[in-house]
């Protein structure tokens, strides 16, 4: 029983840890205009892997697409790879594990094959969790970087022929739902394989014991006996949590910069 | 879009005034009211400007003892009252529906306000 | 507060010319993450309310006539009239969208000889 439930639970924590980071590399806010020092623009940047929005106070709101791929950064580039590959790792550990659950019979599926399926989805949201800990982890490295590069800019002042507020970018909200996503992803996965142990068969062979009885030799030999902790087929319910990344940028919506949020 | 604000007044120094700003032909909610000062045969001056939805606001430094902003959904109006009026509050007031750009795309007629004793 | 300085005070051309007007402004206005100037014109009739001629430093509102071109960035934005007509007499407005609180310039007074 313990077994079941500890594959259940890992099998829904990974499902929304991959909703999340699938939600995170969605999201346009990976970077939010840094307000600390600049509270008095109404105009407020973020960026995200795959376009770049700025807010009007008036509520008005633009993204733009980054419709170039060799003129970005390799960083962000490195980025979106990890994140997808953490997407793809997960999207397949999850299809593996829906296979792999007790509760689930699919023919006349072994104990071993599911024990080694569980496994093997286990393996594949701990992958897919630290991508999505080391894409967001990059960006969060990025940013700071590029933070005190910039705080150096304001004060040793910018030269050059266009003339800006120089705009400096702390983390967004993306960041952490990738955090806490990839977090929830590499729990599920270390769940997974700790309940593949459970399921895995041990072949417990006792050895042969001859009993000498008066007048005859015969030697009496009990079959080996499979030992399984797993219990026979636990008909449960199973539902299929679906998540669903959105993002919020279309909507009229007000930075917080503001006091009228 | 129609910003349609109410009649002129004369007011006694030290009490306070309220302008209204009726909105239609648009949704109200989804456009801030901005607020707009301007003194005869002078300059413009922002107030502030408030987000009909919400009911947020956000003030000029310079007016928030002065001026409150608030709206009613229901009737599709933005107010604004004026505290301890005093002579230099004698100017005509615009409402203004804001834009791209922070910009004020559309205006109402004007209210002008003259404190007399 | 951002300073919006407008020059010339005040111009006085005949119908056909054509005008140009300035503004400076004390700090860029143009914002990094879209690269558009938060800088806008108003035309003000004796009279009446200002109304919008263009947004974002260039982008000129629907309604308005082609001859209203503005232009500049960062911190130099001028308003051009290609050929002034008798109903542009008027006094021109420019305003900063950028910084709390908006500022508007001291403007610029059109009058037609």
């Known amino acids: 029983m313990a077994v079941t439930a500890c594959q259940g639970l890992g099998f829904v924590v990974s499902l929304i840890g991959i909703a999340g980071i699938i939600a995170a590399t969605c999201m346009d806010q990976w970077s939010t205009q840094d307000l600390y020092n600049n509270p008095v623009t109404a105009v407020f940047n973020y960026q995200g892997l795959w376009r770049s929005c700025v807010r009007e106070s008036s509520g008005f709101t633009e993204c733009r697409g980054y419709f170039t791929l060799l003129g970005l950064p390799a960083m962000l580039q490195a980025v979106r790879a990890l994140m997808i590959v953490g997407i793809v790792l997960g999207a397949i550990g999850l299809l593996v594990s829906i296979f792999a659950l007790k509760c689930i019979r699919i023919g006349s599926m072994e104990d071993s094959a599911k024990a080694n399926m569980t496994l093997t989805s286990g393996i594949m949201f701990i992958v897919s969790g630290l991508c999505a800990i080391a894409g967001v982890s990059v960006f969060a490295n990025m940013l700071v970087t590029n933070f005190w590069m910039s705080t150096a800019n304001m004060y040793t002042g910018m030269g050059g022929m266009v003339q800006t507020v120089q705009t400096r970018y702390t983390f967004g909200a993306a960041l952490f739902v990738g955090w806490v996503a990839g977090g929830l992803t590499l729990i599920g996965g270390v769940m997974m394989c700790i309940a593949c142990r459970g399921l895995a068969p041990e072949e417990t062979n006792y050895k042969a014991v001859s009993y000498h009885a008066s007048g005859h030799s015969v030697a009496y030999k009990p079959g080996g006996f499979k030992a399984s902790t797993g219990f026979g087929s636990n008909t449960k319910n199973k539902k299929i949590y679906d998540g669903g990344a959105r993002t919020e940028d279309e909507v009229q919506s007000y930075p917080s910069k503001h006091d009228y949020v | 879009v129609q910003l349609q604000q109410s009649g002129a007044e004369l007011v006694r120094p030290g009490t306070s005034v309220k302008v209204s700003c009726k909105a239609s032909?648009?949704?109200?909610?989804?456009?801030?009211i901005e607020w707009v000062k301007q003194r005869p045969g002078q300059g413009l001056e922002w107030i502030g400007m408030?987000?009909?939805?919400?009911?947020?606001?956000h003030y000029n430094e310079k007016f928030k003892v002065k001026a409150t902003l608030t709206a009613d959904k229901s009737s599709s109006t933005a107010y604004m009252q004026l505290s301890s009026l005093t002579s230099d509050d004698s100017a005509v007031y615009f409402c203004a529906r804001g834009g791209f750009g922070n910009s004020f795309a559309y205006w109402g007629q004007g209210t002008l306000v003259t404190v007399s004793a | 507060d951002i300073l919006l300085t407008q020059s010339p005070l005040s111009l006085t051309v005949t119908a056909g010319e054509k005008v140009t007007m300035s503004c400076k402004s004390s700090q860029s206005l143009l914002n990094g993450g879209n690269l558009k100037n938060y800088l806008t014109w108003y035309q003000q009739k004796p009279g009446q309310p200002p109304k919008l001629l263009t947004y974002w430093a260039s982008t000129r509102e629907s309604g308005v006539p082609v001859r209203f071109t503005g232009s500049g960035s960062g911190t130099d934005f001028t308003l051009t009239i290609s050929s002034v007509q008798a109903e542009d007499l008027a006094v021109y407005y420019c305003q900063n969208g950028y910084f709390y609180p908006y500022t508007f310039g001291g403007g610029t007074k059109l009058e037609i000889k």
């Open positions: 032909r648009y949704a109200f909610t989804n456009y801030l």
């Open positions: 408030i987000n009909p939805g919400s009911g947020g606001t």
